[in-house]
Amino acid sequence: QLPPGKPEIFKCRSPNKETFTCWWRPGTDGGLPTNYSLTYHREGETLMHECPDYITGGPNSCHFGKQYTSMWRTYIMMVNATNQMGSSFSDELYVDVTYIVQPDPPLELAVEVKQPEDRKPYLWIKWSPPTLIDLKTGWFTLLYEIRLKPEKAAEWEIHFAGQQTEFKILSLHPGQKYLVQVRCKPDHGYWSAWSPATFIQIPSDFTMND
């Protein structure tokens, strides 16, 4: 029987900069029941606070609701693991909410085959940003990535769309049914999950681009 091993806070994520959650990985338990507590203070403060919500984020997590989340202040936090034999602390972790945003997937993915008379045909893909992300404030730049593949293919073809919310693809295999998905990330945040797949049938007379 030993004191607990050192825990590690390894992940913090915010869906929209208004709330965030951090998760820790326990160290060894020393063969005894172990209690974990997360304490934090914000830049410019000395007063330590305990995690406001250990439930919402699941096991070994701390969730900061709206009233506990500030974009203006860096959070300094650590986890304490305690059993009957003693305690151990994680390293201090510094969190700026701006840099942990992982948005929801883009919405309203629409895919259409366009066949202009005077030009090569193309696949036109359009989507909307996730609703929780407020792009009007200006500091939030979302970048998008598209992936597509014929239904039975193993490999995805990836296209980086930058800040655009629509994209054209010229080179496709005629007569194939394609799956199309899109995801997004803030410039210094994390990629969202891929959106649900949209299917599109490419006509047999679709001319491949050279």
Epitope: E43, M71, Y94
Partner: antibody
Amino acid sequence: QVQLVQSGAEVKKPGSSVKVSCKASGYTFTSYWIHWVRQAPGQGLEWMGEIDPSDSYTNYNQKFKGRVTITADKSTSTAYMELSSLRSEDTAVYYCARSFFTNWFAYWGQGTLVTVSS
Amino acid sequence: DVVMTQTPLSLSVTPGQPASISCRSSQSLVHSNGNTYLHWYLQKPGQSPQLLIYKVSNRFSGVPDRFSGSGSGTDFTLKISRVEAEDVGVYYCSQSTHVPFTFGGGTKVEIK
């Protein structure tokens, strides 16, 4: 404890490439961005670029765009910085540095001296 | 790119005396999220840089309270209230509001 251990000094010919490694330990490698900063002899610090090891997403200083490639190998917890088309002005100490969930550098490697000379 | 200008270039200080380093940026360092990402690093002789102050005025873990940072917008200052022998080295200001991140040219502090 957090450690960033870099590869050893290199001497390279003009026009060639160099690849510097930065092995991370003491934390979950995929959690935090790794940055590369260089320092020419007797000069200041110059940020080259950064990588998120969780998905290898990169941002580069446009000054080095096309010449620098930053990669990460999750299996060995190692980040790499490759600089191509070397010239004498690239003689410098190259540092890797780690952020938290922030955009400043809390931990630094020991530095790797790259000398470009014919 | 944002140009960071530090003054003075070098500083010779008697132990126990104060020291002050100025840093000016070519454009405002207020991020569109409201934060100011101006930091100070110290590079001791033969060592890698180490973080002293983040976001203008916040001491990093383990940094003695004789170090303090202040300023806003484009003008920033690092003060050492009582210089000690271990404080010798080159001090750099750095901004991470705008990409590419940039550093000042450095201020060399030595002991008289």
